[in-house]
């Protein structure tokens, strides 16, 4: 379809103008330097070759410069997240230049047309950056491009086209359709900036994935596996992206990347940490809570620069709202014997008791199955900081809560009607905190009583060896 701009990225504004003689030509990309946290303030519109607006709005050549790039839109008006992000940047980096890249005329199109327009918008940003580089003291290394959805790929184009290398690009749930599997020069990629970090919050392996699934940065962070975000509800609904309609679920999950980034700016005392892992399933098993060899990082603005030879996929769990931080724990439970287990997997819950607080009852998600005479690893997370752990209550749920399990129990009963009680034996639980990297072993309160059966509980207390540090580095990072 025809693209509504000329080679200089200018839009012929013929809307509501019946006569061709009335046509006025306007820039299709505008750069608004937000000089104040006040949304009422008009800011200054920057234009290549015109230095006056830089002076009028006190552009700080030696400070950090943020370019915020919105994505495809079904509205002629900025979406609400933009104000929150600008405000958060002003709060965190008081001397920084915050520039809103307004490409609404080219983004408020059919999605396919908006995608076709990303390249020209990237060119416009690159031209602006090339011009700014001509000024004394302006450094491309101080430039941080922040692009949401389609805007992330615009940032990629800008980084690709600019003379030199921008300091950082943050991709906030980069758009998936028409970019998944694309050549690196046609999407955001690690070579577009000195450091490219990406948050993926709406990826789907089935149906339409609004956000890109593939890793596209130096670090790619997948909160909650990168798909179903807590607090967004109706998780089984795949939002339609027909022109003019988009479900609240899609908006909530896709936009969550922005809010996670905002959270990292305004709640720097509550940083969220992500952990390197090969895939979401392994992370759910609790296998990947290591901080050795740069395997963990803060997410969002506070991310430590990591230039890996390969893409680094990282995972974390979050709360449903700000502050998003949770506390991750790896639980290793060695099952040394069990009897009469039948077909069904047990449903376990743990409650953690700490010096600061006690957790709620937390489910142990069995990703595959409970292995006998083996160490089974689980991931649990709490919304509150429990402090040092003191004891653990392990509960085996009694009555089955799913029809599937009830059916399996019924079948087991038919095949073994006199099936004696199911039981398994656990002597100790090893716990590792993701946030502190400390390890602790818990032993059963009564060394003689290590068995647990449905509807029963088992208590574990800190073993006598106490906390053990195993040369693991804490994820605490220096804030920029």
């Amino acid at each position: 379809s025809p693209v509504p701009f000329g080679p200089e990225g200018r839009l012929e504004d013929k809307l509501h103008k019946p006569k061709a003689t009335q046509t006025e030509v306007k820039p299709s990309v505008r750069f608004n330097l937000r000089t104040s946290k006040d949304p009422e303030h008009e800011g200054c519109y920057l234009s290549v070759g015109h230095s006056q607006p830089l002076e009028d709005c006190s552009f700080n050549m030696t400070a950090k410069t943020f370019f915020i790039i919105h994505g495809w839109t079904m509205s002629g008006i900025f979406e609400n997240w933009l104000h929150k992000l600008v405000s958060a940047l002003h709060t965190r980096e008081k001397d920084a230049n915050v520039v809103v890249v307004d490409w609404l005329p080219l983004a408020h199109q059919l999605y396919t047309d908006a995608v076709n327009n990303t390249r020209v918008v990237g060119h416009s940003i690159a031209r602006m950056l090339d011009w700014l580089q001509e000024k004394d003291d302006f450094s491309l290394g101080n430039v941080h491009l922040i692009g949401y959805s389609l805007g992330a790929h615009v940032a990629g184009y800008a980084g690709n086209f600019v003379k030199g290398t921008v300091g950082r690009i943050t991709g906030l749930d980069p758009a998936g359709p028409m970019f998944e599997g694309a050549d690196i020069h046609k999407r955001l990629s690690p070579d577009d900036a000195d450091f490219v970090d990406v948050l993926h919050t709406y990826t789907r392996s089935f149906g339409l994935s609004i956000g890109i699934q593939m890793p596209v940065g130096h670090i790619d962070i997948y909160p909650n596996g990168g798909d179903f975000q807590p607090g967004c509800g109706l998780n089984d609904v795949l939002g339609s992206i027909a022109y003019g309609t988009i479900t609240e679920v899609v908006k909530c999950e896709h936009e969550r990347a922005v809010h996670l980034f905002v959270d990292s700016l305004v709640n720097q005392d509550k940083p969220s940490f992500a952990f390197q892992c090969t895939d979401s399933n392994r992370f759910k098993k609790g296998i990947c809570l290591s901080c050795r060899k740069n395997r963990c990082n803060s997410i969002g603005y506070n991310a430590k620069k990591m230039r890996n030879k390969r893409n680094s996929k990282m995972y974390l769990k979050t709360r449903a709202g700000m502050p998003f931080r949770v506390y991750h724990y790896q639980m290793k439970i060695h099952v040394f014997s069990y009897k009469n287990m039948g077909e069904i997997e047990p449903t376990f819950y743990v409650t953690l008791y700490g010096t600061n607080a006690d957790s709620q009852t937390l489910p142990l998600e069995i990703v595959e199955r409970i292995e006998q005479n083996a160490t089974n690893t689980f991931l649990v997370y709490t919304e509150e900081d429990l402090g040092d752990l003191l004891k653990i209550q392990l509960t085996w749920e009694g009555a089955s809560q799913s029809w599937y399990n009830l059916w399996k129990e019924f079948r087991s009963y038919l095949s073994q009607p006199r099936n004696p009680g199911r039981e398994l034996n656990i002597r100790r639980i090893r716990v590792k905190s993701g946030e502190t990297q400390r390890k602790l072993t818990f032993c059963t309160e009564d060394p003689e009583n290590t068995s647990i059966s449905p509807g029963r509980e088992l208590w574990f207390r800190k073993c006598r060896d106490g906390w053990r540090m195993k040369n693991e580095t804490s994820p605490t990072v220096e804030l920029p």
Partner: antibody
């Protein structure tokens, strides 16, 4: 100073259309969104939609989407709101309101235009 | 759509006293909440934007607080000209919606 001046009161028959104008002055018309809000007698304020005057992009409240059209004439710094297929429940005061840079809050309002729909 | 609820339809307060008006959103709207004052026959007037940001020209006795779903407009010492109807409005998601209003009357 910023001023939004609206057209005068209108009396319309059910099924007809009404077009209300809002002339802006005291600021750069294309730099801020313009919104339309109505208030039926004794009712809460109701957002109808908004326009980005820079290029004409609009956003509407689904409730009015099939009946409302918001346009602008940048040369005259004027926004328009046309509501079609009028019914008696459309009797209200219609306001234009200037949005902030992000279009979220409305610091300046027109004086209001009373539209009466009666057979 | 997000439903804005102003639980008190009418609030009676004496001049010089403090008035506290509340507004609740049906879902989290962060700080995207604005307060307006409307007098009979007049257009609304913006008092507070983005939950707590003051507006130039608005007396300092008007202040706003809250985040998420619960918001408050406080008038520290009521003046005679403050008796009017007060509306809250969210701009977190379209359609933007207003509360039904709280009428502040002289006790």
């Amino acid at each position: 100073q910023v001023q939004l001046v609206q057209s005068g009161a209108e009396v319309k028959k059910p099924g007809a259309s009404v077009k209300v104008s809002c002339k802006a002055s005291g600021y750069t018309f294309t730099d801020y969104t313009m919104h339309w809000v109505r208030q039926a007698p004794g009712q809460r304020l109701e957002w109808m939609g908004g326009i980005n005057p820079y290029y004409g992009g609009t956003t509407y409240n689904e409730k009015f989407k099939d009946r409302v059209t918001i346009t602008r004439d940048t040369s005259a710094s004027t926004a328009y709101m046309e509501l079609s297929s009028l019914r008696s429940e459309d009797t209200a005061v219609y306001y234009c309101a200037k949005g902030d840079y992000y279009g979220g809050s409305y610091n300046y309002w027109g004086q209001g235009t009373t539209v009466t729909v009666s057979s | 759509e997000i439903v804005m609820t102003q639980s008190l339809a009418t609030l009676s307060v004496s001049p010089g006293e403090r008035a506290t008006l509340s507004c609740r959103a049906s879902q989290d709207i962060s700080n995207s909440l604005h307060w307006y004052q409307q007098k009979p026959g007049q257009a609304p007037r913006l008092l507070i934007k983005y939950a707590s940001q003051s507006i130039s020209g608005i007396p300092a006795r008007f202040s706003g607080s809250g985040s998420g779903t619960e918001f408050t407009l406080t008038i520290s010492s009521l003046q005679s000209e403050d008796f009017a109807v007060y509306y809250c409005q969210q701009s977190n998601s379209w359609p933007y919606t207003f509360g039904q209003g709280t009428k502040l009357e002289i006790k």
